[in-house]
Every structure is written in C-alpha cells, then in structure tokens.
C-alpha cells in the first residue's frame, strides 16, 4: 500500500508520459489521476517504468475498477499484466482475440503462468467453445496447450479447429486425450485423399481403433515406427502379421529393435510364431506352432 499524500505543487500529471518514470512511488500515487491513466493506458507499455512503479499504477486502476477492468484497459496492459493475480483476472470479461494476443505476447517464450492459464480459461469459457482462431493463437504461443486440457474440455473443440493443430502440439497428449481428438480429426480430414489424409491424421493415431488401423494397412501408408509405438495397445493386438507388415511397409524391420517394448511386445505374444517367422526379422515370443488359441473375450461375449 502506498500512503496517501498530497501531490507536490506543479507535479500533477496532465498526461501519461516519460516524465513519470522520475516520480517516486508516492508521487505517482498522489499525482496520477486514475481516470487519466485508464484513458491513456496505450502509452504505459512504451514508458520504461520499473515494476515497482507499475504496481502503483495497478493500485490506481484497482481503485477505479473494483469489479474488474474494462476490455479497453485490459487490451493495453502490456507488462502491467505480469503484476495481475489470477484473482484479478477472474473479474475480467475478455472477448476480443486481439486482447488475448496482446497479453500472450507479454508472456511469450516463457512457460504458461497461472495468470495466463486463468486468462485463457476466462476467454475460452466466454466464447463457449475452442474455435479455430483461438486454437491457432493458443498453440502458436503454447504448443503444448491442447494437451493441457482434460478430455472433457477437449470435447468442446469443434472438428473444424483440428486444422490448426500441428504435430508438435500433440507431443505431450496422453491416450485419453487422443481418444477424444482422433474422431474429430477423422471427421475434419475425411475428404482428403489417401496419402494426404495419412499425413494429417498421423499425429492423432494414438486414439485410433483397430478397424481404422486395418483400413490404413490397405492403403500403402508406410507408417514409421515412432507413430506405431504410440498406437493404443488394445488397437494393435488384433492386427495380423500381414496387416502390420502392410501398415509399416519398409519400416517393418524396425519391429526387431522394439520387440521388448509395448505395444510391439504384447502384439508379438498374440501372434503365431510361424506367422512372425514370415517377416524374417527373428522376432521371438509368439504362440508356438500347434497350440490352440482361445479368445476368451469372444467366448464371454457370446455366452
């Protein structure tokens, strides 16, 4: 808190300009009118204030707008945004994407702060859904943004927004998140031809079911091992050796290096050894020849 003191003679601020950087904190408090500050917020970011001085200016705005700042002020906060608490931000109603971009710019190159997380939450809730322009903006500033959302939050992403997603945006997504995103991506890219479709859908395949993987295996897609290793184990297990060979194409040789890791390890255990031998990779651990394989899950479903 800055104590209330009278403004010294001749120091009353008539406009927000660079002369104010030479004011002591108490002088800023006493000599800068909050309404003047609010109308000239666009000048503040260009003036080399210290954060201590910005704290004083924030205090003045807080007194002027106890219920939360109007968007006309928020849009021009600049580095003053760094002095806001999540509690401050929860009082705001931010509707303009330009305002969001301006504030994200201040935090650019740094991890998402609690302030930014609150701002994004307020913005998205205000919009009702995560539209393409918003998603474009958020993933540009925070590539991991999408994977920070819960499956429930991701369900509000319209399929049209999926076009904004880049492969690196999905790097930290877990299977539950990909389960939600994959059907949206499938819908979004459904009108593309085979090879183009695969390029777009590839990063989402961690959420693909068995039948879609079987369909892909018929399209000469040559899936790389890194993508294969991210597939759902339960989706890979029912694939035959022939289907996996078609799915991976020339990359099938990479299975040997991954034979001890999921999902390859679990898939090997489900295949007949003589089928595995046809690959010529020396994969071991399949079902020995002559053994009868009972699929108990099918038996339970029938009874």
């Amino acid at each position: 808190e800055v104590e209330k003191t009278a403004c010294p003679s001749g120091k009353k601020a008539r406009e927000i300009d660079e002369s104010l950087i030479f004011y002591k904190k108490w002088e800023l408090e006493a000599c800068v009118d909050a309404a003047l500050l609010a109308t000239q917020m666009d000048r503040v970011n260009a003036i080399p204030f210290t954060y201590e001085q910005l704290d004083v200016l924030k205090h003045k705005l807080d007194e002027l707008y106890p219920q939360g700042y109007p968007e006309s002020v928020i849009q021009h906060l600049g580095y003053l945004f760094l002095k806001m608490s999540p509690e401050d931000i929860r009082k705001w109603n931010v509707t303009s994407l330009e305002t969001l971009k301006a504030l994200l710019e201040v935090n650019k190159g740094h991890e998402m702060s609690p302030q930014v997380a609150t701002l994004i939450d307020r913005f998205v809730k205000g919009r009702g859904q995560l539209d393409k322009d918003t998603l474009d903006t958020l993933t540009a500033f925070y590539p991991g943004y999408l994977c920070s959302l819960s499956p429930e939050e991701l369900s509000s992403v319209p399929p049209s927004s999926i076009w904004a997603v880049r492969p690196q945006d999905l790097d930290t997504c877990d299977p539950r998140q990909l389960d939600v995103l994959y059907p949206k991506a499938r819908l979004a890219f459904q009108n593309m031809n085979g090879s183009e479709y695969f390029v777009k859908i590839q990063s989402f395949l961690g959420g693909a079911p068995t039948e879609d993987l079987k369909a892909l295996s018929q399209q000469n897609v040559s899936m790389d091992l890194a993508t294969f290793m991210k597939l759902r184990t339960d989706a890979v297990l029912p694939l035959t050796v022939a289907e996996v060979q078609k799915l991976l194409g020339p990359h099938v040789e990479g299975l040997k290096a991954e034979e001890r890791h999921r999902p390859v390890r679990d898939w090997i255990l489900r295949q007949r050894q003589d089928d595995l031998d046809t690959l010529g990779l020396g994969l071991q651990g399949g079902i020995p020849n002559g053994y009868l394989v009972l699929d108990l899950s099918m038996q339970e479903a029938l009874s």
Epitope: F49, T50, Y51, L82
Partner: nanobody, 116 residues
Framework: QVQLVESGGGVVQPGGSLRLSCATS????????MGWFRQAPGKGLELVAR???????MYADSVKGRFTISRDNSKNTVYLQMNSLKPEDTAVYYC??????????WGQGTQVTVSS
C-alpha cells in the same frame, strides 16, 4: 540470476565529480534498459538517469546537464558520470533494471556524500 555491483562512491566537496560504475556478472535481458537510482536518508527511491536498450538516455530534471549515463557493452558495465555535485546529491546510489518476467533487480548500492 545476474548480479549488479556498484562502485565509485565516496566523499566529495560541492562542485566536485565522481564516476560510478555498475558491473553486471553477465548479459542482462532488460525490458527498460539500465537505470541509476538514489535514496537519500528518510526519502523514497528516485530514478536519476536511465539508458534504454537502444542507447536513448533520460535524466531527472534535478541532474540534467550535470550527470551523464553511458555504457560499455563489451565490459557489461554502465556508468554515471556526476559533475558539479551538490549537497542534495548525497544518497546511496543503486543501479537497477527490470526483466521481462515482472521483477526489478538492484545492486547493493554505493554511498555518495557531498560535503565541505
């Protein structure tokens, strides 16, 4: 975190000169360049002079024409040349800057006393 170390303070007679130095322990990433501040006994901290990232200099009215701020990037050092010193310039002088994350940084200060 980059350290700021001021030096060059001392006792000087009115009308005399001093040159303060502020050495940084590494490259600083400052939002508002580097400033020289001072705090007289019982008074608030005030900015005396600032040199922005683009080299622009700014001075408080009370020191204009007497003090000069400059920097030597190769030595990671900022200077304050103080001429025609007056008793009212007596204070602890600090260098400081603001980063891009919401924090102000200050050195430990150097005492300047102007007295006959």
């Amino acid at each position: 975190q980059v350290q700021l170390v001021e030096s060059g303070g001392g006792v000087v007679q009115p009308g005399g000169s001093l040159r303060l130095s502020c050495a940084t322990s590494g490259t600083i990433f400052s939002r508002n360049g580097m400033g020289w501040f001072r705090q007289a006994p019982g008074k608030g901290l005030e900015l005396v002079a600032r040199i922005l990232n683009d080299g622009t200099t700014m001075y408080a009215d009370s020191v204009k024409g007497r003090f000069t701020i400059s920097r030597d990037n190769s030595k990671n050092t900022v200077y304050l040349q103080m001429n025609s010193l007056k008793p009212e310039d007596t204070a602890v002088y600090y260098c400081g800057y603001s980063d891009y994350r919401g924090t102000d940084y200050w050195g430990q200060g150097t005492q300047v006393t102007v007295s006959s």
